[in-house]
């Protein structure tokens, strides 16, 4: 049978001779040269050669474990005389043993990492890793130990894990932000003769909110014209914060001062400035200077740094209101006046007053905007603002007159303002009442006395304060001997009643009744209206059957016998 141990070979052999691997040997070998050893398989005849007489195997070339860690070859032992095998063809392994020919290589040539400023000592920063191509199962060729070559006393590295940690207290980003740390990885467990590789770790301290905002000056002054509408920016203030990002974000607020209600401050998110704006309308003539206390604060604070003091600062802002030439201001936003409709021309209705609000108190002249009074019904005294009529009025034509009055500064005609005037025309009893409609009625020939044949109603264009009160009566010339009577109902209506039993249409087919309607106002107004009454033949139900269309009308307008 075959007699051999496992074959090992050190890689990277540098000797001038072939490297001895080992010996193939059969227990059938008597040492007389009768056996021939044959080598075949992986690298046989090229990498590995055998002395066919002795069975000694040699390697002809430098072998690299990283290229191939194991070679499997076949061995044969043949009787030279018979040519027959004395041993079965068998396989064996030549294992390439590792030497330390690979330095540790970091997975990255440069690492980048961040760690918050002011971190506690021992805070994890980053883990670096180096790999070694040598055999980790054989010796210490691949056992890597990490050490720090540059970056102390700020950082340290764990020798076994490659974990980099902070090593110094109170590292302040505002003082120094960037650190370059050089880490060495050395194999052979870090011992002498070990191979090494290095990497650079660029560490950036990230910001924490350890700095409050600070105003660069304690007082700011801005000017703004009194005409600035609400929302107008007046000026910008900026507190500086040594932090960055959200830690440097600043919110501004007005905390005190007489201008608390008059001004606002808004934060410009892009520039981190505070913009002072007008909140309410300003008036130079009322107040010329305002003082505000403005506060700048960090919205994102870190509780662990609150011991450093409040994360806010305040400054005084002085706002000077500048005078603007303003148009005259009327004493009212609108005027409501009233006048009787019977007012004579040049009757004064009332007056308007406007004043220049500026300190100069420029005199003012008044005028009527003729676009609003095309018929020139009204006029105004340009000096004192008195409004008077220039035409007669009629309430029944127009109850309200809406006109506009203009006040203009005499010294500066560009400065003018307008005010609406609402003039109400008051009623005067200048219209007589009259029938609400034309009345033509009929009476049956067989009508009985005191029978109601028509109800009368009246209308009046006037609008008395206490309402209409009309009275109805027959005209005096028709009152005596009339065939009909008027009954005043005292409710602004009246009834026409028959005065006799029966009417003959052949005798008198039509009656004309003159009715006087009076109002109860002052001065009393009255009118006379005529009611036509036709005599008709009726059925027994009182329904009209036939009437004469013609009426005998006397020159006086009264029918005979009315």
């Amino acid at each position: 049978s075959w007699m051999w141990n496992q074959f090992f070979l050190l890689e990277e052999y540098t000797g001038s001779d072939y490297q001895y691997v080992g010996k193939l040997h059969s227990d059938q070998d008597r040492g007389d040269g009768s056996l021939k050893y044959i080598l075949s398989g992986d690298g046989a005849g090229d990498l590995f050669i055998i002395n066919e007489n002795t069975g000694d195997i040699q390697a002809t070339k430098r072998l690299d474990r990283e290229e191939k860690p194991v070679y499997i070859l076949r061995a044969q032992a043949i009787n030279r005389r018979t040519g027959r095998p004395v041993e079965p063809e068998s396989e064996f392994i030549i294992k390439i043993h590792d030497i330390n020919d690979n330095e540790p290589i970091f997975t990255k040539e440069v690492y980048t990492a961040t760690v918050p400023e002011m971190s506690d000592v021992g805070t994890f920063v980053v883990q670096v890793t180096a790999t070694d191509a040598d055999d980790p199962t054989y010796g210490n060729s691949a056992k890597v130990v990490y050490s720090i070559l540059q970056g102390q006393p700020y950082f340290s590295v764990e020798s076994e894990t490659g974990i980099i940690k902070t090593a110094l207290l109170n590292m302040d980003r505002e003082n120094r932000e960037q650190y370059q740390v050089v880490i060495q990885a050395k194999d052979m467990g870090g011992q002498m003769g070990g191979l090494s590789g290095t990497t650079t770790v660029n560490i950036t301290l990230t910001d924490v909110n350890d700095n409050p905002p600070r105003f660069p000056q304690s007082t700011y002054q801005f000017k703004t014209p009194e005409s600035s509408p609400p929302g107008t920016p007046i000026g910008r203030i900026k507190a500086s914060d040594a932090d960055v990002g959200e830690n440097a974000e600043i919110e501004y607020s007005i905390t005190d001062g007489e201008g608390l209600d008059m001004f606002d401050v808004i934060t410009d998110q892009e520039t981190q400035e505070g913009i002072i704006t007008v909140k309410k309308l300003l008036d130079f003539e009322k107040k010329k200077v305002y003082t505000l206390k403005v506060e700048a604060s960090n919205p994102h604070v870190e509780p662990r740094f609150l011991y450093l003091g409040p994360f806010k600062d305040s400054a005084t802002v002085r706002i000077v209101v500048e005078d603007v030439d303003e148009p005259p201001v009327f004493s009212k936003l609108a005027y409501i006046l009233q006048i009787r409709e019977d007012a004579q021309i040049n009757t004064t209705i009332g007056s308007v007053t406007a004043q220049d609000p500026d300190a100069a108190r420029n005199p003012v002249k008044y005028s009527v905007d003729r676009h609003t009074d095309m018929d020139r019904i009204f006029n105004i005294d340009s000096g004192n603002g008195s409004i008077f009529t220039s035409k007669l009025l009629d309430r029944e034509t127009l109850l309200w007159h809406n006109i506009t009055v203009i006040a203009t500064e005499i010294n500066n005609p560009k400065q003018s303002s307008r005010v609406p005037l609402y003039i109400k025309v008051l009623d005067v009893n200048d219209n007589a009442p009259e029938f609400a409609e034309f009345y033509e009625t009929f009476v049956c020939e067989k009508a009985k006395a005191d029978q109601l044949i028509q109800t009368l109603r009246a209308v009046d264009k006037d609008d008395p304060y206490s309402g209409h009160q009309f009275s109805f009566s027959l005209a005096p010339e028709a009152a005596s001997g009339s065939n009909f009577t008027i009954q005043d109902n005292k409710d602004n209506t009246a009834g026409i009643l028959t005065r006799k039993n029966g009417y003959n249409r052949h005798e008198m087919s039509t009656y004309l009744l003159p009715v006087v309607i009076s109002d109860n106002d002052y001065p009393v107004q009255s009118s006379t209206g005529t009611v036509t009454v036709r005599v008709c033949a009726c059925d027994h139900h009182g329904n009209m059957q036939s009437c004469h269309a013609e009426a005998l009308i006397h020159p006086t307008g009264l029918s005979t016998g009315a």
Epitope: S40, G41, E66, E67, P69, I72, E89, E91, N102
Partner: antibody, heavy 120, light 108 residues
Framework: QVQLLESGGGLVQPGGSLRLSCAAS????????MHWVRQAPGKGLEWVSF????????YYADSVKGRFTISRDNSKNTLYLQMNSLRAEDTAVYYC?????????????WGQGTLVTVSS | DIELTQPPSVSVSPGQTASITCSGD??????VHWYQQKPGQAPVLVIY???NRPSGIPERFSGSNSGNTATLTISGTQAEDEADYYC??????????FGGGTKLTVLG
């Protein structure tokens, strides 16, 4: 010419067994180490197992260790892969490949592959 | 143990040079082989021992290996070169490892 031809693939239930064969021709089969490599549908190549030229040495990927057995019959110029306790994740095309002398674990040539489907 | 990483895909215009990388720690110390696999076919060895071409493989295929990256280069890429490409090395003792594969697309 040098040729490898796999057979024995098919549909099998999880937990079942299958035996793949690889018939070699056109070269001295007994002089070469052989390998099995598989490829799941739409996925990359995964090495499965190795056997030395005379069958003295075998080696397996961790994913199949204890379940698959590689063997060869040099007299029949045939390589085998006995697969037991099959799982759904063993579904793949299985290739046999020759390890080329002097190339350092390079595979040339490869068989055309046989599909193994593990499904219930 | 070595882990091999390849880009999932690479695109190239016909006639241009395609470079497919295979990265792994200290890969330069290991022997790398490259295979081409076309759809429905078995893989074919195109480069062995980092930069050697088997007979029958066109001269436009070449390989290199340095640092942490091995590279397969196809100069003057042709439409027929469109395929999946795999790098391969040994992992530990007698085990073998493949890269995840790269799909090469020849545009146009």
């Amino acid at each position: 010419q040098v040729q490898l031809l796999e057979s024995g693939g098919g549909l099998v239930q999880p937990g079942g067994s299958l035996r793949l064969s690889c018939a070699a021709s056109g070269f001295t089969f007994s002089s070469y180490a052989m390998h099995w490599v598989r490829q799941a549908p739409g996925k990359g190549l995964e090495w499965v197992s190795f056997i030395s030229s005379l069958g003295s040495y075998t080696y397996y990927a961790d994913s199949v260790k204890g379940r698959f057995t590689i063997s060869r019959d040099n007299s029949k110029n045939t390589l085998y892969l006995q697969m037991n306790s099959l799982r759904a994740e063993d579904t793949a095309v299985y290739y046999c490949a020759r390890e080329t002398a002097g190339y350092g674990y390079a595979f040339d040539p490869w068989g055309q592959g046989t599909l193994v489907t593990v499904s219930s | 143990d070595i882990e091999l990483t390849q880009p999932p895909s690479v695109s190239v215009s016909p006639g241009q040079t395609a470079s497919i990388t295979c990265s792994g720690d200290n890969i330069r110390k290991y022997v790398v082989h490259w295979y081409q696999q076309k759809p429905g076919q078995a893989p074919v060895l195109v480069i062995y021992r980092d930069n050697n071409r088997p007979s029958g493989i066109p001269e436009r295929f070449s390989g290199s290996n340095s640092g942490n990256t091995a590279t397969l280069t196809i100069s003057g890429t042709q439409a027929e070169d469109e395929a999946d490409y795999y790098c391969q090395s040994w992992d530990s003792f007698l085990a073998v490892v493949f890269g995840g594969g790269t799909k090469l697309t020849v545009l146009g």
